[in-house]
């Protein structure tokens, strides 16, 4: 499937998914959204945070010197999103071992701005993205993913830290955006909705999809997130929609069928490793990019993101699994954890593809009114 | 010699409890994956349950057959392997091996040492 | 769970036969496939890990092929002592899954 008034060569379906910000992301207004701190949930805007990787939530890569390559988790800040009282079950918080920094969630107080400062900054993410208003860049070239096929052993953590459901990867997965822009791949998570009420946190023209999944990187020049965070490129995300579709998604079940294990907050299993890029789209070169910033607290911005035009497809079923299984603090379901769409304030989306060209009716005439910046030269 | 020793089989009744046992000997304990297979008479080999090693955490895997009824565990100073088995069916009845796989240099799960078995008849 | 199909059930072949046995994953588990050998009254054997490698000490006839969800396990000359029940088991997640076992015979 296409994303809306894709081009119809750009399937926005039937892949994977996996963007995650390493930090995390606050319910900041939207484009869309009045730009009010604590945007109350649309129809399909709700407002949801959950614990991406957020600072405490980012693994830490050592410097090769050192004896374990291993990627870490680092004890980053957690922040409390700002809550939404309409929605009582959107308060997942994280709370984790050893963490100093107060806590946040999706709804409520505090407000994100609070916990940091950085979430009321003026590039901060998720967006809405117009495909007709995209600049279609030439220079975005194929992602190159090396290393994601991971073999059963050794396993993976896959834990329930109050915001999302977070997958822990090992080192060796190594990502390249383009020529000298390459990355680490730290952790995925996913942001869903609830029964009937879709939870990515992009939108495509205003429009809402089921779930999405991040999947967090470093760059290859910082040995650690927290040297990264705020700085122009430190972390890239991958970013992909999961829609529903008629048959069973093996990749995702190998994750799904687990959730049960760790429906309690702060719970965690291992689970066999996995062909990481099944759980994304099979087109690595349609995508739209753009800087923002982590999603939840401490909303650093400087990250680039990288949003699949195809999506993945998963079964009714397991979407269901995904926004009905875990729980969050207060023994709230753990659901509608995605942020407000945040305003783009002068940014301009950039497209792998001539995105604003569009077969459908309903742009005749497609005007591409953005121009390339060469991103990636 | 790599060894594993199977133990503590018998005729148990529907409903009862059996504790079995597996000696391992022969390389180092804590490093291994260790899992219990059995095979019913005259049928094909079910694995029944898994214990992590020292870098994975001891922690425990069941298959949906047993789940909430057997318990695996281990005792990595006595170098022993155990099966806790509770609520006994007819159908639990078989051959039970002890078996090594998976370690700190696999890539995967498979089974490259196994016991002799031990006998488990549960029966009225 | 991975289910596992082997073929055929049984088999019989001559002394010095080519025998060939056939296992099918329902999903991709890439290489992760291991062949055993269990003759009557004894504990299973690992023969093939890794879809095509060797276990230690398993003779030279004794081989593996395939990828994703087809596997093939081969003996290329048969001898009077590969009379056994020949079994696949995947290793890609759990709950660990076999096939449900070739009986091998002598004509």
């Known amino acids: 499937q296409r994303l809306p008034r894709m081009q119809e060569d750009s399937p926005l379906g039937g892949g994977s998914s996996g963007e995650d910000d390493p930090l995390g992301e606050e319910d900041l207004p939207s484009e869309e959204d009045s730009p009010r701190e604590e945007d109350p949930p649309g129809e399909e805007d709700l407002p949801g945070e959950e614990d991406l990787p957020g600072e405490e939530d980012l693994p830490e890569v050592k410097p090769k010197s050192e004896e374990e390559g291993s990627l870490k988790l680092e004890d980053l800040p957690t922040v409390e999103a700002p809550g939404d009282p309409q929605e009582p079950q959107n308060n997942a918080h994280r709370d984790k071992e050893g963490d100093d920094q107060s806590h946040w969630r999706y709804g409520g107080d505090p407000p994100w701005p609070r916990v940091s400062p950085a979430c009321a900054g003026r590039f901060q993410s998720p967006v809405d993205i117009r495909p007709q208003l995209a600049a279609f860049c030439p220079a975005l070239r194929p992602l190159e993913l090396l290393g994601f096929q991971l073999p059963p052993l050794p396993e993976l953590r896959l834990r329930n830290n109050g915001h999302s459901v977070q997958l822990t990867l090992p080192p060796g997965l190594e990502m390249a955006l383009g020529p000298g822009r390459e990355y680490r791949a730290l952790q995925l998570h996913l942001h869903w909705g609830a029964a009937g009420r879709p939870g990515s946190e992009h939108t495509v023209e205003g429009h809402r999809f089921p779930a999405e999944i991040h999947v967090v990187h470093l760059s290859t020049a910082f040995a650690r997130v927290d040297e990264a965070l705020g700085r122009p490129g430190g972390l890239a995300v991958l970013a992909a929609f999961l829609e529903e579709g008629p048959e069973e998604n093996s990749a995702y079940e190998q994750l799904l069928s687990r959730l049960e294990e760790i429906a309690e907050e702060g719970s965690e299993t291992q689970v066999p490793g996995l062909d990481i890029s099944a759980l994304l789209p099979s087109d690595f070169s349609r995508y739209f990019q753009y800087e923002g910033s982590l999603t939840t607290p401490p909303c650093a911005q400087g990250v680039i993101w990288t949003v699949f035009n195809q999506t993945v497809m998963l079964s009714a079923k397991q979407l269901h699994t995904l926004s009905d299984t875990l729980w969050g603090p207060g023994d709230s379901r753990l659901q509608l954890n995605f942020r407000a769409t945040q305003p783009l304030n002068g940014r301009v989306i950039e497209a792998s593809f001539p995105a604003g060209v569009d077969s459908s009716p309903r742009a005749a005439e497609p005007v591409q009114l953005n121009s390339c910046l060469a991103a990636g030269d | 010699e790599v060894q594993l020793v199977e133990s503590g089989g018998g005729l148990v009744q529907p409903g009862g409890s059996l504790r079995l046992s597996c000696a391992a000997s022969g390389f180092t304990f804590t490093d291994y994956y260790m899992h219990w297979v059995r095979q019913a008479p005259g049928r094909g080999l079910e694995w029944v349950a898994f214990?992590?090693?020292?870098?994975?955490?001891?922690?425990?895997q069941y298959s949906a057959s047993v789940k909430g009824r057997f318990t695996i565990s281990r005792d990595n100073a006595e170098n022993s392997l155990y099966l806790q088995m509770n609520s006994l069916r007819a159908e639990d009845t078989a051959v039970y091996y002890c078996?090594?796989?998976?370690?700190?240099?696999?890539?995967?799960?498979?089974?490259?040492?196994w016991g002799k078995g031990t006998t488990v008849t549960v029966s009225s | 769970d991975i289910q596992m199909t082997q073929s055929p059930s049984s088999l019989s072949a001559s002394v010095g036969d080519r025998v060939t046995i056939t296992c099918h994953v329902s999903?991709?588990?890439?290489?992760?496939l291991s062949w055993y050998q269990q003759k009557p009254g004894k504990a299973p054997k690992l023969l093939i890990y890794q879809a095509s490698n060797l276990h230690t000490g398993v003779p030279s006839r004794f081989s593996g092929s395939g990828s994703g969800t087809d596997f093939t396990f081969t003996i290329s000359s048969l001898q009077p002592e590969d009379i056994a029940t020949y079994y696949c088991q995947q290793g890609q997640s759990y709950p660990f899954t076999f096939g449900q076992g070739t009986k091998l015979e002598i004509k």
């Open positions: 078996v090594r796989g998976g370690h700190a240099g696999s890539n995967y799960w498979y089974f490259d040492v």
């Open positions: 214990i992590r090693n020292k870098a994975s955490g001891y922690t425990p």
């Open positions: 999903q991709n588990i890439n290489v992760w």
